[in-house]
Amino acid sequence: SPTPFGPEGQLADELHKPKAIQTEVKPSVRFNLRTSKDPEHEGCYLSLGHSQPLEDCGFNMTAKTFFIIHGWTMSGIFENWLHKLVSALHTREKDANVVVVDWLPLAHQLYTDAVNNTRVVGHSIARMLDWLQEKDDFSLGNVHLIGYSLGAHVAGYAGNFVKGTVGRITGLDPAGPMFEGADIHKRLSPDDADFVDVLHTYTRSFGLSIGIQMPVGHIDIYPNGGDFQPGCGLNDVLGSMAYGTITEVVKCEHERAVHLFVDSLVNQDKPSFAFQCTDSNRFKKGICLSCRKNRCNSIGYNAKKMRNKRNSKMYLKTRAGMPFRVYHYQMKIHVFSYKNMGEIEPTFYVTLYGTNADSQTLPLEIVERIEQNATNTFLVYTEEDLGDLLKIQLTWEGASQSWYNLWKELRSYLSQPHNPGRELNIRRIRVKSGETQRKLTFCAEDPENTSISPGRELWFRKCRDGWRMKNETSPTVELP
């Protein structure tokens, strides 16, 4: 349904009319200062040029000020994530001002119309910030704009239009359609604040990408590759309700960015770390777990500002729910020789044993073919903190790459019944922890017995020389 202002042009016309003939219309953007953690409390509505509500509602001029900016809405109501974020900010920053930017009338439109309204809303926020800057003790450096979906681009416009530089903008899965590949002044970009950090959780290289794929901040974090989020599959959605729909999956993955941010606020003791990498495939191979030269960072609220970084793509794995933190390990396995392997591609499984806990049996994801007489790198992650690793159990299975290969193997086996068993020779496994940056080499328990057949197990223990402690930790990143 049409709103008093509608698209930007109408608003501009309205604002430029002489005061005497301006029609009596309410602004389509309002600023709700959340004065209580109680989500049902009405809060206080701030009004440009009116100082009384600031005083009445206890606006703290010297404290941090958060502006939460929602996105496009089909329902015309605030979505359920909003009060979770408000509550989490109040919990973490007790003295902070938390302002919800309500632009529902302009967002409850056709998506294209809502996109056209983002500039207007950004302008309204900038005007509010300009007015607040006129007050003593209010600093733009203490302002943190948090925008979800379309709201992330609204935050970008606000940062662009404001007089001065906003301290920080966090983009929570910024909207993709109509923004992908757009000019930097027409979308969220690193120029919009002193620090722009972005979480991408629903990006797709095929079909419609609800979230923007391109990096748009100083640091751009792609949890689980930025696409398929654990706990959001159709099966998971089906499990939590009578019927699961693609819409629910989309909502789950898109909104995951908000929950990751909330997690970073409330589970301060369980920070998730992301690692700089050129692309998702390289990260999946486990070759990007370095913290040297600011190559790793906390995600969400705890992210550290990285100087001289722009469009730095970072990756991590997460759990399916809060707390989202996992423990990343790089595993380097040197496969010395194949024996009677034919066309069979091995799939490795490891079980990690630590001082605190033991992991489940973890498959090593094969991104590329396993190379013989070469070091193969894998990424594994555990949901629990294992402590210091003590030993590793390795098994493998032969997985045929196609039905044709399976037939070839079967035919080969039938024609050579005395064919000796397939074997791999693995003497050591090198492990690096992403979270602690410690490196460790594990040697086969029995150096004389390093061949392993499918379904059999090989045990590895810390090599005699123990830990090879290479401290790669960056001074700007506090690792646990």
């Epitope: 709103t3 309410k26 709700n32 015309g76 979770k84 408000v86 009338p105 309700m241």
Partner: antibody, heavy 120, light 111 residues
Framework: QIHLVQSGPELKKPGETVKISCKAS????????MNWVKQAPGKGLKWMGW????????TYAGDFKGRFAFSLETSASTAYLQINNLKNEDTATYFC?????????????WGTGTTVTVSS | DIVLTQSPASLAVSLGQRATISCKAS??????????MHWYQQKPGQPPKLLIY???NLASGIPARFSGGGSGTDFTLNIHPVEEEDVATYYC?????????FGGGTKLEIK
């Protein structure tokens, strides 16, 4: 003290129009949305929709699109429900109920109710 | 739309005893740690009154003999001990998504 006071009972003929009022007091009218709920005689509660009291944007439930209209007189802190082209099945008690914009959106304050009887 | 099924449709309980009303949702009404399920009491000729919000929180001015529980798709309202003034119809409601829907109601009578 928060109150929602509704207009009195109405007796109408089929095809006529009725307009019910809901006057709010004790809180800032524009800071909470207003729901409308129908209760047919001896039946349960059915949500008709709501109106954003700040922007004036109404939202109608599937069964209440067309003949039903929500409106506001913000200066008088009053919400209205108008039913056009009344039918016999519109005979019911209509309640206004306040809901927050944030949080869990339950209906914490209810109007006194207005009984509409449609009979030829 | 989310369908809420209340049981039993009517219930007769002796004074001082416990009354338990069930409400089953066609899909989960949980969001994170919150349940968007609420309970209302309606006495004859009166508007409904909020009793319990978010599954287990007592609304302002409601006596402690009313309690709510449950999560996901299964919720209960308990009244203990039942008093004469509790004779009414009780409705559950979900607000996890629009349209908000109500259960069919449970009529409580005194035995």
């Amino acid at each position: 003290q928060i109150h929602l006071v509704q207009s009195g009972p109405e007796l109408k003929k089929p095809g006529e129009t009725v307009k019910i009022s809901c006057k709010a007091s004790g809180y800032t009218f524009t800071n909470y949305g207003m729901n409308w709920v129908k209760q047919a005689p001896g039946k349960g509660l059915k949500w008709m929709g709501w109106i954003n009291t700040y922007s004036g944007v109404p939202t109608y439930a599937g069964d209440f699109k067309g003949r039903f209209a929500f409106s506001l007189e913000t200066s008088a802190s009053t919400a209205y429900l108008q039913i056009n082209n009344l039918k016999n099945e519109d005979t019911a008690t209509y309640f206004c109920a306040r809901r927050g914009y944030y949080g869990r959106r339950y209906f914490d304050v209810w109007g006194t109710g207005t009984t509409v009887t449609v009979s030829s | 739309d989310i369908v809420l099924t209340q049981s039993p449709a009517s219930l007769a309980v002796s004074l001082g005893q416990r009354a338990t009303i069930s409400c089953k949702a066609s899909q989960s009404v949980d969001y994170d740690v919150d349940s968007y399920m609420h309970w209302y009491q309606q006495k004859p000729g009166q508007p409904p009154k909020l009793l319990i919000y978010a599954a287990s929180n007592l609304a302002s001015g409601i006596p402690a003999r009313f309690s709510g529980g449950g999560s996901g798709t299964d919720f209960t309202l308990n009244i203990h001990p039942v008093e004469e003034e509790d004779v009414a119809t009780y409705y559950c409601q979900q607000t996890i998504e629009d349209p908000p829907t109500f259960g069919g109601g449970t009529k409580l009578e005194i035995k």
